[in-house]
């Protein structure tokens, strides 16, 4: 039931991902299902807004980090990818696409420059970046 899937483009090492939808899913075809979430990595570089639109067109959103336990596979993600965290100037907060506010200690936020969007990096790090910069991205869909 569990199979080792090596996703060289996304993960730093071999990760154990359930491949049968009886244990997780349903998910769109070729997406990764893990602990009731569907994930897909897109290796074409887009700015944050284009990345968001791409995810939305597939009935998904950009990656939302909400639990280190339920999303422990994210520890192994390599490189940097757009996630759904964005600065809302009108109220000064950093929010996910669904409007929920980032829990202060869920991500280690690293600011290398001024920016209003964030990239996800391994071990639950978020890098502040200019939203117009092209980057790869991760889409996510909740199964429950």
């Amino acid at each position: 039931i569990w199979s080792a899937v090596f996703l060289n483009s996304l993960f730093n090492q071999e990760v154990q991902i359930p491949l049968t939808e009886s244990y997780c899913g349903p998910c769109p075809k070729n997406w990764i299902c893990y602990k009731n979430n569907c994930y897909q990595f897109f290796d074409e570089s887009k700015n944050w807004y284009e990345s968001q639109a791409s995810c939305m067109s597939q009935n998904a959103s950009l990656l939302k980090v909400y639990s280190k336990e339920d999303q422990d596979l994210l520890k192994l993600v390599k490189s940097y990818h757009w996630m759904g965290l964005v600065h809302i100037p009108t109220n000064g907060s950093w929010q996910w696409e669904d409007g929920s506010i980032l829990s202060p200690n869920l991500l280690t936020i690293i600011e290398m420059q001024k920016g209003d969007c964030a990239l996800y990096a391994s071990s639950f790090k978020g890098y502040i970046e200019n939203c117009s910069t092209p980057n790869t991205y991760i889409c996510m869909q909740r199964t429950v």
Partner: antibody, heavy 120, light 107 residues
């Protein structure tokens, strides 16, 4: 006009707790984060913690076990409470408004500060 | 924690001179550095944000440069009102820290 004003006890006995209020005007605490800093006499600035627009907080780990920051948006007030004060906590304490850019960012408006002396 | 080292500790200048303050970070922090001026018995005042961005109301003689680990604050044509302590602050990650400061004094 954007302003921040700290008010504190002035003198605190060793082992006692410190409470300081930061009252802001000219902007809303629902739109700007507020951070607390301190500066011992003749020394540099130290960041104690920050309270975000939604009420979440980050504390400097040096003070985490004895520091609390809360706020009342309707009264435009932010409160700092620090427990178990010692003489080396003697300092001028400032609140400051985080600028509206970036994540951790910079501090564009500062209060005048309140001097806290820890002595018996 | 990120350590910010400011040098020199004291700078002596004559009015009209150009002066530069150095701030070095213990690791690369991009452009996430900010500069403050603190006159005697006064609160800090933001001078420069994100290494080189100017602040409304701050005289144009103040400028900043640098990225990565090495940053510089410069004052062209120093005036007597510029006598103060100058601090750099990083915003790369929590906790935010400041340099120990550089004191600008008149010769």
């Amino acid at each position: 006009q954007v302003q921040l004003k700290e008010s504190g006890p002035g003198l605190v006995a060793p082992s006692q707790s410190l409470s300081i209020t930061c009252t802001v005007s000219g902007f809303s605490l629902t739109s700007y984060a507020i951070s607390w800093f301190r500066q011992p006499p003749g020394k540099g600035l130290e960041c104690l913690g920050v309270i975000w627009t939604g009420g979440g907080t980050n504390y400097n780990s040096v003070f985490k076990s004895r520091l609390s920051i809360i706020k009342d948006n309707s009264k435009s007030q932010v409160f700092l409470k620090m427990n178990s004060l010692q003489t080396d906590d003697t300092a001028r304490y400032y609140c400051a408004r985080k600028g509206d850019e970036g994540y951790w960012g910079y501090f564009d408006v500062w209060g005048t500060g309140t001097t806290v002396t820890v002595s018996s | 924690d990120i350590l910010l080292t400011q040098s020199p500790a004291i700078l002596s200048v004559s009015p009209g001179e150009r002066v530069s303050f150095s701030c070095r970070a213990s690791q690369s922090i991009g452009t996430s550095i900010h500069w403050y001026q603190q006159r005697t018995n006064v609160s800090p005042r933001l001078l420069i944000k994100y290494a080189s961005e100017s602040i409304s109301g701050i005289p144009s003689r103040f400028s900043g440069s640098g990225s990565g680990t090495d940053f510089t604050l410069s004052i062209n044509n120093v005036e007597s009102e510029d006598i103060a302590d100058y601090y750099c602050q990083h915003s790369n990650r929590w906790p935010l820290t400041f340099g120990a400061g550089t004191k600008l004094e008149l010769k």
